[in-house]
């Protein structure tokens, strides 16, 4: 009985299409597949950013795979051919590994890259990113931001920079159609007549960096002799009510009475007849049903009642 062997895939490579971290891994079928003509060959692909402890593993019948990587680091990948037992009339067979790597040759020292990059998607409508210039770079250094997400034909450059002392320190993005719930890739590179500038790469999903507007129309309603209902409305904009969490801060007679997190636009408060003053503020955040993370809004304007019997009326500012 001769042992059945299969070769690894040929021409395994990582291709950078210029999407700032979204790379193509591609290969060709192994040599001498003629013996397995009636056979569906599969490929096991393992890949990771260099320095990562874990490999990502996929099995595919294709000759390519696409995924996102951190281009601040190198990438390594390996692939082998898999034959299920139906191909060999015996046991499953796998080839040796074919391996490849990819990295962008870094220019400049790390200190020259932008510092403290911060991106916020205001009210799920307007993306703004800001940064500080690299350490020790001269005023002739300018930074340029490029971005890409699936749906764009190619990476785009920022067209509305925020400037300080003639340097780009931020970007106001245009309307970004169909850009949430997918990886959003950014590269900030730079140029200087004095010295080369290191590029920086960032990846995030827009729904996870949303800072909503604060809630509006805060009201009080007396529910019973010892209960007051606090109500507010969701802020204007595209974020649906089901996507909000709220934090309320209530002060009774200058003492913090309650801080609470709620999912609805109401909160019922137990009070005493002695209450002379009641104030509350609310802020909002996108909840776990709509994102993995988020940023609290600013606090709403304060809504207060004072000097009248709370039981006598509904209070509306």
């Amino acid at each position: 009985d001769t042992e059945i062997k299969v070769n690894p895939p040929q021409d395994f490579e990582i291709v950078d299409p210029g999407y700032l971290g979204y790379l193509y891994l591609q290969w060709q079928p192994p040599l001498s597949l003629d013996h397995f003509k009636e056979c569906t060959v599969e490929y096991e692909l393992k890949y990771r950013n260099i320095g990562s402890e874990t490999w990502k593993t996929i099995i595919t019948k294709n000759l390519h795979y696409k995924d996102g990587f951190d281009l601040n680091k190198g990438i390594e990948a390996k692939i082998h051919t898999l034959l299920p037992w139906q191909c060999t009339n015996g046991s499953e067979v796998q080839s040796s590994w074919a391996e490849t790597t990819y990295w962008i040759s870094p220019q400049g020292i790390p200190e020259t890259k932008v510092q403290d990059m911060d991106c916020v998607y205001y009210n799920w409508q307007y993306l703004l990113c800001s940064w500080k210039p690299g350490i020790g770079v001269l005023l002739d250094t300018n930074y340029n931001l490029f971005y890409w997400y699936e749906g764009l034909d190619h990476a785009l450059q920022c067209v509305d920079y925020i400037k300080a002392d003639g340097q780009n320190i931020g970007c106001r993005f245009p309307y970004l159609e169909a850009s949430d719930y997918k990886d959003f890739y950014i590269c900030v590179n730079g140029s200087s007549e004095n010295k080369p500038i290191r590029s920086s790469y960032f990846t995030f999903q827009l729904q996870n960096i949303v800072k909503p507007l604060p809630p509006v129309y805060l009201t009080f309603t007396r529910e019973s002799s010892c209960e007051i209902k606090l109500k507010w409305s969701i802020p204007l904009g595209p974020i649906p009510a089901r996507c909000f969490d709220y934090e309320i801060e209530i002060r009774e007679d200058d003492t913090t009475l309650v801080t609470a997190t709620v999912e609805n636009e109401t909160y019922t408060l137990k009070t005493t007849n002695e209450t002379r003053q009641l104030c509350f503020v609310v802020r909002s955040k996108v909840n776990i049903y709509c994102s993995d993370d988020g940023i609290w809004s600013e606090w709403s304007d304060k809504q207060c009642w004072e000097g009248e019997d709370l039981s006598k009326k509904t209070l509306l500012r």
Epitope: T40, T60, K61, P84, W85, Q86
Partner: antibody, heavy 121, light 108 residues
Framework: EVQLLESGGGLVQPGGSLRLSCAAS????????MSWVRQAPGKGLEWVSG????????YYADSVKGRFTISRDNSKNTLYLQMNSLRAEDTAVYYC??????WGAGAFDYWGQGTLVTVSS | DIQMTQSPSTLSASVGDRVTITCRAS??????LAWYQQKPGKAPKLLIY???SLESGVPSRFSGSGSGTEFTLTISSLQPDDFATYYC??????????FGQGTKVEIK
């Protein structure tokens, strides 16, 4: 006749562990990749994990990676799913399924009757 | 991950009707698609594999077609036994293997 018989389901508290078994008969077990697929009450099908015929390749859905371990004992024609750190969202009927053709997963031509796992305090 | 989207979610039909269920993949999966039938309280049953191959023992009124990203399951003449939920599933690239959300075929 191909048969797959799951066992080991039951009620468990959040954070607890269970081990599911699937006894296979009627086919050459060691040759076929196998998978676990679950179905939460009133919901659709969700693939959980797969394993190659030899047991050398194991694959997981992100939702269970690091918590569940698939294994097989080809001498006993049995597939296993060790479930640790269970959560309420793991509540489902768990099916074992035989892969019709392929290395680690594929179309599933035979399914067990399912075993119910309930995670609740 | 490859997403699978089925339509419609629910389909009301009568015995004898020709029924078509559609499954769309978020990227090309060639012909690596299966269709299953599931009845309440029972395990799924394989109907079609490799997009168009009829599983042994499945009535010929079931057929599958399509490749790439668009697939259909057709029941040429709906029978009383066919009222069930149907799922598509891709096995082109994994993990994960992914299923459509299901289409319930109910009596009109």
């Amino acid at each position: 006749e191909v048969q797959l018989l799951e066992s080991g389901g039951g009620l468990v508290q959040p954070g607890g562990s269970l081990r599911l078994s699937c006894a296979a008969s009627g086919f050459t077990f060691r040759r076929y990749a196998m998978s676990w697929v679950r179905q939460a009450p009133g919901k659709g099908l969700e693939w959980v994990s797969g394993i190659s015929g030899s047991g050398g390749g194991t694959y997981y859905a992100d939702s269970v990676k690091g918590r569940f371990t698939i294994s097989r004992d080809n001498s006993k024609n049995t597939l296993y799913l060790q479930m640790n750190s269970l959560r309420a969202e793991d509540t489902a009927v768990y099916y074992c399924a035989k892969v019709r053709y392929g290395w680690g997963a594929g179309a599933f031509d035979y399914w067990g009757q399912g075993t119910l796992v309930t995670v609740s305090s | 991950d490859i997403q699978m989207t089925q339509s419609p979610s629910t389909l009301s039909a009568s015995v004898g009707d020709r029924v078509t269920i559609t499954c769309r993949a978020s990227q090309s999966i060639s012909s690596w698609l299966a269709w299953y039938q599931q009845k309440p309280g029972k395990a799924p049953k394989l109907l079609i594999y490799d997009a168009s191959s009829l599983e042994s023992g499945v009535p010929s009124r079931f057929s599958g077609s399509g490749s790439g990203t668009e697939f259909t399951l057709t029941i040429s003449s709906l029978q009383p036994d066919d009222f069930a939920t149907y799922y598509c599933q891709q096995y082109d690239t994994y993990p994960p293997i992914t299923f459509g959300q299901g289409t319930k075929v109910e009596i009109k």
